[in-house]
């Protein structure tokens, strides 16, 4: 794609530091801790990517439309030959008009028959659809609304029970890791206590007695 934004897509630019002029900037410093992990993509970059995606989508749609036009052209060229009038006399042109009128009449008849078939099919489809709904116990599909969804919830929705297992496992792994670090900390603490105890009189006494 001959577009200038392709290089920008490779290396995200760092967001410029806020200019300390407006009170809103200070409010941001007050409410958000400085150590907070910054978003990987800046707002401007997000916008740039969105624009790029829209551009790609637009090009795709245009390409599809062009393909459809080409397909239509090809279909018409096979059905309708170009008028080759060069050298044909008045007699042939009159005859040709008769031929074309006859062809138009024939095509009209065919179109009428096809339309009748299509109407019949539509009616049949409608009847069958109704029967399906009747068999389902007149089940009415709820209207779908857009909802915000977390990554975990999306995973769960996509993978079902398997996702739940993997999520539980991940939580379990985190838990185990936490317990291990606590245990290590406890052991380190006890060892220090022991050293302190031995270094005092009590320790000397115990040492002497032993």
């Amino acid at each position: 794609m001959a577009d200038g934004s392709s290089d920008a897509a490779r290396e995200p630019r760092p967001a410029p530091a806020p200019i300390r002029r407006r009170s809103s900037n200070y409010r941001a410093y007050a409410t958000e801790p400085h150590a907070k992990k910054k978003s990987k993509i800046s707002a401007s970059r997000k916008l740039q990517l969105k624009t790029l995606l829209l551009q790609i989508a637009k090009q795709e749609l245009e390409r599809e439309a062009e393909e459809r036009r080409g397909e239509k052209g090809r279909a018409l060229s096979t059905r309708c030959q170009p008028l080759e009038l060069a050298g044909l006399g008045f007699a042939e042109l009159q005859d040709l008009c008769r031929q074309l009128h006859a062809r138009v009449d024939k095509v009209d008849e065919e179109r009428y028959d096809i339309e009748a078939k299509v109407t019949k099919n539509i009616t049949e489809i409608a009847d069958l659809t109704q029967k399906i709904f009747d068999l389902r116990g007149k089940f009415k599909r709820p209207t779908l609304r857009r909802v915000r969804i977390s990554a975990d919830a999306m995973m769960q929705a996509l993978l079902g029970a398997r996702a739940k297992e993997s999520l539980d496992l991940r939580a379990h792994l985190k838990q185990v890791k936490k317990e291990d670090t606590e245990k290590e900390n406890r052991e380190v603490g006890d060892w220090r206590k022991n050293i302190d105890a031995l270094s005092g009189m009590e320790g000397r006494k115990k040492k002497f007695e032993s």
């Epitope: 030959q81 060069a86 050298g87 044909l88 006399g89 007699a91 042939e92 031929q99």
Partner: antibody, heavy 119, light 113 residues
């Protein structure tokens, strides 16, 4: 110089078939409508068939419709006439003719002819 | 079908004489949209193929001598040779190019005295 040369004529039995050819030169063949015209032994001229420049449109008199087929090969600059179910009344000198320019009328150029005898 | 009738079927003329031959159609050959009559005249010399002389009833084909003149409109047409020459010895055919099937007259045979 416009040149039209017919070939393929000969003696054939009634009910037989024959294919005539007409080699064209000296003009842009694919730009002109072409026709076959025959002349009976009594010197009467009969129009046999016409084909448009690209071959999409074809015209015949009732006397040959369903028996004769006109066709052309623009790549080879050749006009054809396939004659099936030949009858004694088809005996004639067969000429291939080039139509005039679009703003004019009539058969501007004729070949020397090829003789077809059905007997 | 349009029937083309030519008269006379033959004529014998001396060199330098004026000749007029006639051609009648069973229906009008006039195209009202362009006011042109779709009639052509052909000359066929012995042992040769036909040659176009006149189209649109009165338009002389390029290379055709001026002594050949076509006239008429609707259903009545004539071909006149103002001063017959020895090389004009031939059969002359009229043809309608107004409607299919394209039809020819039976011809007029020009002979020299």
């Amino acid at each position: 110089e416009v040149k039209l040369e017919e070939s393929g004529g000969g003696l054939v039995k009634p009910g037989g078939t024959l294919k005539l050819s007409c080699a064209a030169s000296g003009f842009t063949f694919s730009s002109y409508a072409m026709s076959w015209v025959r002349q009976t032994p009594e010197k009467r001229l009969d129009w046999v068939a016409t084909i448009s420049s690209g071959g999409s449109y074809i015209f015949y008199p009732d006397s040959v419709k369903g028996r004769f087929t006109i066709s052309r090969d623009n790549a080879r600059n050749t006009l054809y006439l396939q004659m099936n179910s030949l009858r004694s009344e088809d005996t004639a000198m067969y000429y291939c003719a080039r139509h005039h320019n679009p703003d004019k009328s009539g058969f501007a150029y004729w070949g020397q002819g090829t003789l077809v005898t059905v007997s | 079908d349009i029937v083309m009738t030519q008269s006379p079927s033959s004529l014998a003329m001396s060199v330098g004489q004026k000749v007029t031959m006639s051609c009648k159609s069973s229906q009008s050959l006039l195209n009202s949209s362009n006011q042109k009559n779709y009639l052509a005249w052909y000359q066929q010399k012995p042992g040769q193929s036909p040659k176009l002389l006149v189209y649109f009833a009165s338009t002389r084909e390029s290379g055709v001598p001026k002594r050949f003149k076509g006239k008429g409109k609707g259903t009545k047409f004539t071909l006149t040779i103002s001063s017959v020459q020895a090389e004009d010895l031939a059969d002359y055919f009229c043809q309608q190019h107004y409607s299919t099937p394209l039809t020819f007259g039976a011809g007029t045979k020009l002979e020299l005295k």
